[in-house]
């Protein structure tokens, strides 16, 4: 049973721990955080690039996705790979760079304020929209037609933060991803010691809002490393 606090990102203090059922990460996940590649910074130049192990796209940077480095490679070995630019082949939205989505196997541009009707062979799917509100019925459209794009509100399922309304981010919540509030000053935040170390979290908090950074709370400096409380503070 997990005694993790399921932070709603909407309160200044942590709620009492809420009981939870056990989460069982797959082998790729449980192995990944234990693997430490030498060399450090994954944002160094390509010559010094160190692959970062991952299990899911959200463990990688915003310009990356999680996949096997070799085509048809071992599914158990996945690393963060650079996102695919426009007109490149893709299998899912996260493979495409921000501002694009995967349509019929190709990364295409998405409009921030509207989304294009997504045509597949016999169905239409709306991408970038709040995915709980997808129609269950076929809606044939032309590529040039536009539909009004409603941004996801708090608690809505999302694929990436651009799916969410202003002031919200798309964060892991158990086996799904939902829109959660960006953290305000004084709210508890998660400071990852290294990129991707949140891989085993069953839920994620959003990042701190504009002008704020996630830092150790002043009165917690003396606490042990493991119990230090981080909060969003002014720069």
């Amino acid at each position: 049973t997990l005694n993790s606090v399921l932070n709603s990102n909407a309160i200044k203090n942590l709620p009492p721990p809420l009981g939870g059922a056990a989460g069982h990460p797959g082998s790729a996940v449980s192995a990944a955080p234990g693997i430490l590649y030498p060399g450090g910074n994954k944002y160094q130049t390509i010559d010094n690039y160190q692959p970062y192990p991952c299990a899911e796209d959200e463990e990688c940077g915003t310009d990356e996705y999680c996949a096997s480095p070799t085509r048809g490679g071992d599914a158990g070995v996945q690393i963060c790979l650079a996102c695919r630019k426009r007109r490149k082949r893709c299998m899912r939205h996260a493979m495409c760079c921000p501002g694009n989505y995967c349509k019929n196997g190709i990364c295409v541009s998405s409009d921030q304020n509207h989304f294009r009707g997504e045509i597949e062979e016999t169905i239409t799917e709306s991408f970038g929209n709040d995915h709980s509100t997808l129609d269950g019925y076929s809606r044939r459209t032309t590529l040039s037609s536009k539909m009004y794009h409603t941004k996801g509100q708090e608690g809505s399922v999302c694929l990436r933060s651009s799916d969410c309304a202003s002031g919200l981010c798309c964060a892991r919540h158990f086996w799904s991803k939902i829109c959660k509030p960006v953290l305000k000053e004084g709210q508890v935040c998660t400071k990852h010691r290294r990129k991707g170390s949140h891989g085993l979290e069953i839920f994620q908090r959003c990042y701190c809002g504009e002008g704020l950074s996630c830092r150790i709370q002043k009165d917690h400096h003396q606490a042990s490393n493991s119990s230090r409380l981080h909060t969003c503070q002014r720069h």
Partner: antibody, heavy 115, light 108 residues
């Protein structure tokens, strides 16, 4: 349109096993977490298990932990629930559904555990 | 576990009347991580509301959700014949995600 079709239900003796399948279509399967929910005859809804889009993260209700295994094959757009050591209290209609709040549901498949 | 208690257990109303269904959580949800479903006999449930107040696609405007903290409400402004069914609430803040026991809306 989005469609979820369960199969694999049936009559099984206590202690027996069954594997349920849920064939998904009409959406990009690997973008979504999937959920199994069950409903005993004349009763309410009970969450059973959930799995993330890539299959890396799985979650179980205490009542089925250690007996049931959720999995998915994204290349086949199919969700599975392997049920072992079945008990009479596992008798229910099993539904597969999309995401943590269930925006689309299958029609359900009946699992009866009885001797 | 978070327990959701729905009331009343049964609501007897006539078409055209307003229905107010309550869902109370045993702990403060802090966030609007609550959904409502409708289920008719022999059918799978259908999502009506998510995020406490967002209507799912295809759900008529007569259905609305509200509330926060521990108290949530589903309102059907004017009952249509097809609205007579069982309604469930679900919280997805913490695991296990739990459902209320249901409220049956029946024809008076």
């Amino acid at each position: 349109q989005v469609q979820l079709v369960e199969s694999g239900g049936g009559l099984v003796q206590p202690g027996g096993s069954l594997r349920l399948s849920c064939a998904a279509s009409g959406f990009t399967f690997n973008n979504y977490g999937m959920t199994w929910v069950r409903q005993a005859p004349g009763k309410g809804l009970e969450w059973v298990s959930g799995i993330s889009g890539s299959g890396s993260y799985t979650y179980y209700a205490d009542s089925v932990k250690g007996r049931f295994t959720i999995s998915r094959d994204n290349s086949k757009n199919t969700l599975y629930l392997q049920m072992n050591s079945l008990r009479a209290e596992d008798t229910a209609v099993y539904y597969c559904a999309r995401t943590i709040y269930m925006d689309y549901w299958g029609q359900g498949t009946l699992v009866t555990v009885s001797s | 576990d978070i327990v959701l208690t729905q009331s009343p257990a049964t609501l007897s109303l006539s078409p055209g009347e307003r229905a107010t269904l309550s869902c109370r959580a045993s702990q403060n949800l802090f966030s609007p991580y609550l959904a409502w479903y409708q289920q008719k006999p022999g059918q799978a449930p259908r999502l009506l509301i998510y995020g406490a107040s967002n209507r799912a696609t295809g759900v008529p405007a007569r259905f609305s959700g509200s509330g926060s903290g521990t108290d949530f409400t589903l309102t059907i402004s004017s009952l249509e014949p097809e609205d007579f069914a069982v309604y469930y609430c679900q919280q997805y803040l913490s695991l296990p995600t739990t459902f209320g026991q249901g409220t049956k809306v029946e024809i008076k």
